[in-house]
């Protein structure tokens, strides 16, 4: 059995481990801590620039957080023999700006992946599917955590960030078994319409702290297993009838809508009526108007149709610039 090892005990061994020999079962990479009894390897806050090659075969939980990995190439975790037990991989806060196609290939048990807090200027469409086939082998991923992966403006590619992330999520229909997806704090202005249709097993979806203005073109219809939908801290103004009906039709869902700038005019009437009768929205009594000024801080549940008016549109001849 391996004790919790640090660089002091494993560095001498590492010097002789540069060949392609399979790792010894109890080996611990330099700058890492290992416990076979916990099936865990932690290489945390060590400024690593690449994934250690000599990871022990028993690893089920791998923490590579707080490093300086920059690029995750294809086959970054491919080993011979493979890391067949690796189930949870946390790469958060490791200064990744590029995740290439096939980065997570040859990890047959990988169920949980956290790439949060990495400024991903490039996320390959085939990062999770591993191949460019129209239908690829199903990914074993069940939980995918992609909070705060938006790069700074000067590092963005020409294409939209939303589109880049969406392409990786839908490629090859590989993520059909995904249960949890976190996409919080990514400055999303919209959600590409085809994404959710390719993720039919979702139970938990976190889109909080983005800049979503509307859900008009988003369909939740086939997310029949969805239990939690987090839309807090966005820029939502109103939810329209189509969205309301779809949410109401999901059998298990709880929706979180706090801290959105709701516009309480005549277009809000349907949503207010729905809020009063639905059990879907958690904390619905906390939802308040942000606009127009005269309605600011009014509680949505306390509004009636007389409160929700729209200023008449003036004929063009009477409008001023």
């Amino acid at each position: 059995t391996s004790s919790a090892s640090s660089s002091s005990s494993s560095a001498p061994f590492l010097a002789s481990a540069a060949s392609a020999q399979p790792p010894l079962p109890d080996q611990c990479p330099a700058l890492c801590e290992c416990s076979e009894a916990a099936r865990t390897v932690k290489c945390v806050n060590r400024n690593l620039t690449e994934v250690p090659t000599d990871l022990p075969l028993y690893v089920r939980n791998l923490f590579l957080t707080g490093n300086q990995l920059a690029v995750l190439p294809a086959g970054a975790f491919a080993r011979r023999p493979p890391l067949a037990e690796l189930a949870a991989l946390n790469l958060s806060g490791s200064r990744l700006d590029e995740v290439r196609g096939g980065a997570f290939e040859h990890l047959p048990s990988l169920r949980q992946l956290d790439l949060s807090h990495n400024p991903l200027a490039y996320l390959s469409p085939f990062a999770f599917s591993g191949s460019n086939a129209s239908i690829s082998a199903p990914s074993p991923l069940v939980e995918l955590i992609l909070n705060h992966i938006v790069p700074p403006d000067d590092k963005r590619q020409n294409r939209s960030f939303e589109g880049m992330v969406a392409a990786a999520l839908v490629a090859g229909r590989a993520l059909q078994g995904l249960h949890l997806l976190e996409l919080a704090s990514n400055h999303f202005l919209y959600l590409p319409r085809d994404v959710l249709a390719q993720l039919p097993s979702l139970r938990y979806l976190d889109l909080s702290n983005n800049s979503l203005v509307s859900l008009t073109y988003v369909s939740f219809r086939n997310l029949t297993h969805l239990e939690s939908l987090h839309l807090e801290d966005n820029a939502l103004k109103v939810l329209h009838n189509g969205t309301l009906a779809e949410l109401q039709g999901l059998p298990h869902v709880r929706v979180f809508l706090d801290n959105n700038p709701w516009v309480c005019d005549c277009h809000m009437a349907d949503m207010v009526t729905w809020l009063k009768q639905t059990g879907v929205v958690q904390g619905k009594d906390r939802l308040t108007c942000a606009f127009p000024e005269k309605m600011r801080n009014r509680v949505l549940l306390e509004l009636n149709s007389a409160d929700l008016d729209c200023d008449p549109i003036l004929p063009p001849s009477l409008q001023t610039s």
Epitope: S2, S3, S35, A38, R39, T40, A87
Partner: antibody, heavy 122, light 107 residues
Framework: QVQLQQWGAGLLKPSETLSLTCAVY????????WSWIRQPPGKGLEWIGE???????NYNPSLKSRVTISVDTSKNQFSLKLSSVTAADTAVYYC????????????????WGQGTTVTVSS | EIVLTQSPATLSLSPGERATLSCRAS??????LAWYQQKPGQAPRLLIY???NRATGIPARFSGSGSGTDFTLTISSLEPEDFAVYYC?????????FGQGTRLEIK
């Protein structure tokens, strides 16, 4: 949330075999590590051993020659057998589970059975 | 095997006071250490895992610290329900081992 319910004989004679079973409710069998721990009267906790969903076991060396832990995934149950018991094996026996593959995964045993008091007496 | 030694064996304090419990390992266990609370007739309850992470539902007054061989469980302001026996446990190496316990009693 996983819950554990355990049962088995509470009174044994010296040299008999202790046999306890723990049923798992409300969760998947994979990803968990299933353990047995015991606590003699008025004393501390002693880890007996553990098994994972694939049947891989680890035992306390002090008990290894007498212990068998097995798993029946079809019934969502795991079991403990301790042979050739003596009065020193009198204790409360707990089954426990820890989940090693969630982000806030626990290195400790995070779900415990209610405990079974086993008395060895002639 | 790794031996965990807890101190003190008994700690007598009053509600509202701060409790500091110690656990020392015979060799490094890195951060692979947990703390449990046990009340009479009950199974142990996980408080802290990974040396410093509070388990789900555990009040913020419980905190853990340490790495390597020396670990501390701190209860910032004792509530009446906190008086119990506390165990540390390592998952660095087989066999998994527990400390002998610290009994926290009302003064």
């Amino acid at each position: 949330q996983v819950q554990l319910q355990q049962w088995g004989a509470g009174l044994l004679k010296p040299s008999e075999t202790l046999s306890l079973t723990c049923a798992v409710y409300g969760g998947s069998f994979s990803g968990y590590y299933w353990s047995w721990i015991r606590q003699p009267p008025g004393k501390g906790l002693e880890w007996i051993g553990e098994i994972d969903h694939s049947g891989s076991t680890n035992y306390n060396p002090s008990l290894k020659s007498r212990v068998t832990i097995s798993v029946d995934t079809s019934k969502n149950q795991f079991s403990l057998k301790l042979s050739s018991v003596t009065a020193a094996d009198t204790a409360v026996y707990y089954c426990a589970a820890w989940f090693g593959e969630l982000w806030d995964y626990y290195y400790g045993m995070d779900v415990w059975g209610q405990g079974t008091t086993v008395t060895v007496s002639s | 095997e790794i031996v965990l030694t807890q101190s003190p064996a008994t700690l007598s304090l009053s509600p509202g006071e701060r409790a500091t419990l110690s656990c020392r390992a015979s060799q490094s266990v890195s951060s692979f250490l947990a703390w449990y609370q046990q009340k009479p007739g009950q199974a142990p309850r996980l408080l802290i895992y990974d040396a410093s992470n509070r388990a789900t539902g555990i009040p913020a007054r419980f905190s853990g610290s340490g790495s390597g061989t020396d670990f501390t469980l701190t209860i910032s302001s004792l509530e009446p329900e906190d008086f119990a026996v506390y165990y540390c446990q390592q998952r660095s190496n087989w066999p998994l081992t527990f400390g002998q316990g610290t009994r926290l009693e009302i003064k």
